[in-house]
């Protein structure tokens, strides 16, 4: 399911409960995706010892995964709501190709991988409604994404395992940073 249970606007099972605000819905959606990532990481960590490796040991990779930096305005120091929101949406859009790569990379958690992908699409929609400055958001080029996907899928097994681990870890860190920032807005 792309949305946490009870989040569908058609859900009237609890009429006494106040409908979630836009911020609460985004917060819950991120936590739902993080739970999904946690389940996927369990499977990858059971298969290899990469999860125990330090970040430095895994730093040498040619993946250009989105990462929060001071200039993005999402940290406590230098916080800027609008700049940060643009970064979060842009980063999530950039992660989409990597989430596509994750499909078919899991045996027992195939549905979970799909749920993470679909939930991220929903999250992007929620955030786009919140953003005022949509013009500043750059969408990745589909042709570039397609060739990147082909390149990633052509790697040997060990590199594919490494790539899967790095994507999950980076996506988790990006979402955690995003959640911390959104809770300050």
């Amino acid at each position: 399911a792309p949305v946490p249970p009870g989040e569908d606007s058609k859900d009237v099972a609890a009429p006494h409960r106040q409908p979630l605000t836009s911020s609460e819905r985004i917060d819950k959606q991120i936590r739902y995706i993080l739970d999904g990532i946690s389940a996927l990481r369990k499977e990858t960590c059971n298969k290899s010892n990469m999860c125990e490796s330090s970040k430095e040991a895994l730093a040498e990779n040619n993946l250009n995964l989105p990462k929060m930096a001071e200039k993005d305005g999402c940290f406590q120091s230098g916080f800027n709501e609008e700049t940060c929101l643009v970064k979060i949406i842009t980063g999530l859009l950039e992660f989409e190709v990597y989430l596509e790569y994750l499909q078919n990379r899991f045996e027992s958690s195939e549905e979970q991988a799909r749920a993470v992908q679909m939930s991220t699409k929903v999250l992007i929609q929620f955030l786009q409604k919140k953003a005022k400055n949509l013009d500043a958001i750059t969408t990745p080029d589909p042709t570039t994404n397609a060739s990147l996907l082909t390149k990633l899928q052509a790697q040997n097994q060990w590199l594919q395992d490494m790539t899967t681990h790095l994507i999950l870890r980076s996506f988790k860190e990006f979402l955690q940073s995003s959640l911390r920032a959104l809770r300050q807005m």
Epitope: R31, L34, S54, K55, E56, Q176, S177, L179, R183, Q184
Partner: antibody
């Protein structure tokens, strides 16, 4: 066995800068969030700040501008400036396993005592 | 976000049921932890996510609550449980004075 150890605590005069170091044994700090907490004699726990990745930090309102947290793969430093007698406390570092979104501190050092007195 | 703990101290006997409460100034979902601290020692994580027992913690400890109101319960107080207990919100560590509550000292009656 995994553990944390704080060092650098000592007697200093007011205004003297001081750096405390948190050192990990049995694991790499790069995979975890690290927080600093202090406790004045006979008082409760006071949260100071946290370092997430290599460059994202958050600080308590009272610590902003005076305290700075930085990180390497094996250590986390707490740099303190403009110290006063009110900063006299035992300083603890603690680890957050960073697996979830909420902050919780599941491994603590034994603390290092900082005394600020003229 | 401010955390208010009560009572600040209480006296109880071995075998008693003890309840400590913690209130957040705004909703923190279930993102609350409880710690136990003994004199001269570092705090120890007891409960996280309001109700999940940390590894190795006896089942006589339990936590409940969500939103702004939380409770730590010791079902049958043991000699080893006389200590100070702290709640800590993990919802947001930005622009806060303290993540911890003021503490509750559990003393022998």
């Amino acid at each position: 066995c995994q553990s944390l150890e704080e060092s650098g605590g000592r007697l200093v005069t007011p205004g003297t800068p001081l750096t405390l170091t948190c050192t990990a044994s049995g694991f790499s700090l790069s995979n975890y969030y690290v927080t600093w907490v202090r406790q004045a004699p006979g008082k409760g726990l006071e949260w100071i700040g946290i370092i997430y990745g290599s460059d994202e930090t958050a600080y308590a309102t009272s610590a902003i501008g005076r305290f700075t947290i930085s990180k390497t793969s094996t250590t986390v430093d707490l740099k303190m400036t403009s110290l006063t007698a009110a900063d006299t406390a035992t300083y603890f570092c603690a680890r957050d396993d960073s697996s979830d979104w909420d902050a919780k501190f599941n491994l603590w050092g034994q603390g290092t005592l900082v005394t600020v007195s003229s | 976000i401010q955390m208010t703990q009560s009572p600040s101290s209480l006296s109880a006997s071995v075998g008693d049921r003890v309840t400590i409460t913690c209130q957040a100034s705004q909703s923190i979902n279930n993102e609350l932890s409880w710690y136990q601290q003994k004199p001269g020692k570092a705090p120890k994580l007891l409960i996280y996510r309001a109700s999940t027992l940390a590894s190795g913690v006896p089942s006589r400890f339990s936590g409940s609550g969500s939103g702004t109101d939380f409770t730590l319960t010791i079902s049958s107080l043991q000699p080893d449980d006389f200590a100070t207990y702290y709640c800590q919100q993990g919802y947001s560590l930005r622009n806060i004075d303290n993540a911890f509550g003021g503490g509750t000292k559990v003393e022998i009656k």
